[in-house]
């Protein structure tokens, strides 16, 4: 195989590969012919002029996992056929300046993990062939303006994960080629103007992880092809109106972990590719009309972990295909009785964690798919007769931890939790809070004894007992003409009391997702 | 260890309906989009169907659309396909496969199950 | 929708040949594209993602590159178990569509 070296292994088709902590200098003879070279995990520390110099038809050279910390400047004179070059997962601090001059065939160039401080403004002069630059993973503090001007075929490059605050709004001026921009991890605190202007061929911009507290209304103007944008985990506390009207074939888009206290109606373009939207933990306090009316094809949307106290009657309007809504974890007390009116495909609602103090009878009025609902851990007292009427699918309901108000009010809710008992889980069951006699009995399965038809618990109830949701029949109505001829508040008899079992999956996001 | 297994697969006659099943074990479920894929016999890989982590978002090839249903249950780490008005044509070897993304470029099936058999004919 | 096509739609190469399969995607996909393996009777199995990125536990000698329209898998020394067919498929978009596959045999 034309000399292969004894540390490594070679290939009729002209594969060399050298690999092991046994390695500590540059092997050599190489193959003349070798093609594909790959150094990886070695204790190289340093690479010298002359070791490439024999192997001109070296097409891609990978040294990885090394422990190279000096490159010399003519280390790769000769290389004139090299298409790929990966130094990744080094020691690198920095690149002699004409490093690169004799390789400018080259198309991709992974420099990623490394822990270069400062790229040099001619460094990659003569790469007008690169389609990938990686640098993510180092030190760079600033990326000097002209660095990229002639990397007119880029298309992809990633500078995240290194320490820069700023970038100057013409660092990708000549870009036009671009498809995809990394920038996640990085410590930008705001972005002029125009820096993305030129990118009209942009799909991915990453700019999550950063500090960036304002966004330019103008900012993404230029970048109709744009399909994610990730801008989540910043403190980015306004979005400007408009800021997001020419991103027609957006399908991915993160504001999560952000400082947002409100939405500006219409906010969020024409976005028919836009399937989630993700907007937990911010700060939001309340959303006005038509916040979200231009995301028609829209399936989920994740408010929880803000602050809401307030959402107007016609937030939710165009949401025609909203099956998932997340509000858990919100200060709301009150919802009118027409929010969710327009959310005709309602699979999944979670209003759990609030201070909801009642409902409106028509809040799920038009909903009539819903088949999950929480409303754990709010202040309800009771709910309106006929609230879950209509819902023939509805396989899943929490209504743990309110102060449900046990008196004669509460009768049709009772009966109507007794016959459908299994869609309460098998967690956590609703308990009466008062009056003080029957505090902490469960009010699914208390012994309701008043004058009239007495309304029997089952006798001894075990949670394992009972059908499952999935298999349970459709739900039996609270009949909203039932007549409560039963009275008094304290004639009851407590038959059994379940202990809570405290596993409570409260239904959302992942945790991941979710914070 | 990580892993995914298909159930349901049949013999039905066109007309007909089917449910799959896929369980999953190994790693936390409901942190994952997931998907369906299908492969006819000697032809090549058709992506059919995925359903967001939480169950909320779905999304389908229009050759199944109207026809097919995708769901999940968090609880029971299993995935669901309802079939449908099947057809001749959707005779094949049907996959459940994490889909696996982030923000950082990660896109991928990168847990796949073994595979089974639906046979649609009369 | 976008449609992936990959060339050639079969190869016959020995051990230790270099290999490269194209896929060509009929708009800009960015870098969006995975490439996987599939062998007889088996599901298919990740080897890149992110048009590039080597998924953990498969061998160096897999690389892929491209962005766009044109992405290029590249096995550099083939290995007796790497006779199999191989897809690419693309993220960008609904649907996910895959390629048609390209199939290595043993010449």
């Known amino acids: 195989y034309y000399g292969c070296p004894s540390e490594c292994t070679c290939s009729r088709a002209s594969q060399v590969e050298c690999t092991g902590a046994q390695i500590v200098a540059m092997p050599s003879p190489l193959p003349w012919n070798a093609m594909s070279l790959q150094i990886l995990n070695t204790h190289i520390t340093e690479l010298p002029e002359d070791k490439f110099l024999n192997i001109s038809a070296l097409i891609a050279l990978k040294m990885e996992k090394n422990e190279l910390a000096n490159i010399m400047p003519g280390a790769f004179r000769n290389l004139g056929s090299l298409r790929h070059l990966s130094l990744a997962n080094n020691k690198l601090k920095n690149l002699p300046v004409r490093l690169f001059q004799d390789v400018n065939n080259l198309e991709t160039l992974l420099l990623s993990n490394n822990q270069l401080v400062q790229i040099q403004p001619a460094q990659f002069s003569q790469f007008s062939n690169l389609k990938e630059l990686q640098l993510y993973g180092n030190n760079l503090e600033y990326i000097p303006e002209g660095v990229f001007d002639h990397l007119v075929g880029l298309t992809k490059l990633n500078l995240g994960n290194n320490g820069f605050t700023h970038l100057s709004p013409r660092v990708f001026q000549h870009l036009g080629n671009l498809q995809v921009l990394r920038l996640y991890e990085n410590r930008l605190s705001d972005i002029p103007m125009g820096t993305f202007d030129a990118l009209g061929n942009l799909q991915e911009l990453a700019l999550q992880e950063n500090q960036i507290g304002t966004l330019s209304p103008g900012l993404f103007h230029n970048n109709r092809n744009l399909q994610r944008l990730y801008l989540s985990n910043n403190h980015i506390s306004h979005l400007p109106p408009g800021i997001f009207m020419q991103l027609p074939h957006l399908n991915k888009l993160t504001l999560f972990g952000n400082s947002l206290k409100e939405l500006s109606p219409g906010v969020f373009g024409p976005m028919p590719n836009l399937r989630e939207l993700w907007l937990y933990n911010n700060h939001i306090t309340s959303l006005p009309d038509n916040a979200f009316s231009h995301l028609n094809q829209l399936q989920v949307l994740i408010l929880s972990h803000n602050q809401l106290s307030y959402i107007s009657p016609g937030a939710f309007n165009g949401l025609t295909n909203l099956r998932e809504l997340s509000l858990h974890t919100n200060a709301l007390q009150d919802l009118d009785g027409n929010v969710f009116r327009s959310l005709a495909n309602l699979r999944n609602v979670s209003l759990q964690n609030n201070r909801l103090r009642q409902l409106p009878g028509s809040i799920f009025a038009n909903v009539n798919g819903l088949m999950t609902i929480q409303l754990q851990n709010n202040n309800l007292e009771n709910l309106p007769l006929g609230i879950f009427d209509h819902l023939g699918n509805l396989c899943e309901l929490r209504l743990y931890d309110n102060p449900w108000r046990c008196d004669s009010n509460i009768l049709p809710l009772h009966d109507w939790l007794i016959l459908n008992r299994a869609r309460l889980g098998t967690d956590t069951l609703p308990v009466c809070s008062s009056p003080a006699s029957v505090r902490g009995q469960s009010l699914v399965i208390i012994n309701v004894n008043f004058p009239g038809p007495s309304v029997q618990g089952p006798e001894t109830p075990e949670v394992s007992s009972y059908p499952d949701t999935s298999s349970y029949p459709d739900s039996t109505s609270i009949s909203s003409t039932t007549e409560i001829t039963r009275s008094t508040d304290d004639d009851y008899t407590d038959l059994n009391t379940i202990e809570p079992i405290d596993d409570r999956n409260t239904w959302g996001m992942t945790d991941a997702q979710s914070g | 260890q990580v892993q995914l297994v298909e159930s349901g697969g049949d013999l039905v006659t066109p007309g007909g309906s089917l449910r799959l099943s896929c369980a999953a074990s190994?790693?936390?479920?409901?942190?994952?989009?997931m998907t369906w894929i299908r492969q006819a016999p000697g032809k090549g890989l058709e992506w059919i169907s995925d359903?967001?982590?939480?169950?909320?978002?779905?999304d389908y090839a229009d050759s199944v659309k109207g026809r097919f249903t995708i769901s999940r249950d968090n609880a029971k780490n299993s995935l669901y396909l309802q079939m449908s008005s099947l057809r001749a044509e959707d005779t094949a070897v049907y996959y459940c496969?994490?889909?696996?993304?982030?923000?950082?470029?990660?896109?991928?099936?990168?847990?796949w199950g073994q595979g089974t058999m639906v046979t649609v004919s009369s | 929708e976008i449609v992936l096509t990959q060339s050639p739609s079969s190869l016959s190469a020995s051990v230790g040949d270099r290999v490269t399969i194209k896929c060509r995607a009929s708009?800009?996909?960015?870098?969006?594209l995975a490439w996987y393996q599939q062998k007889p009777g088996k599901a298919p199995k990740l080897l890149i993602y992110?048009?590039?990125s080597l998924e953990s536990g498969v061998p160096s000698g897999f690389s892929g590159s491209g962005s766009g329209t044109d992405f290029t898998l590249t096995i550099s020394s083939l290995q007796p178990e790497d006779f199999a067919t191989y897809y690419c498929?693309?993220?960008?978009?609904?649907?996910?569509?895959f390629g048609p596959g390209t199939k290595v045999d043993i010449k």
């Open positions: 496969a994490r889909y696996n993304w982030n923000d950082r470029g990660y896109d991928g099936f990168d847990i």
């Open positions: 190994g790693f936390t479920f409901s942190d994952y989009y």
């Open positions: 359903i967001g982590s939480s169950g909320g978002s779905v």
């Open positions: 708009q800009g996909i960015s870098s969006a």
């Open positions: 992110d048009a590039s």
């Open positions: 498929q693309q993220f960008n978009s609904y649907p996910h569509t």
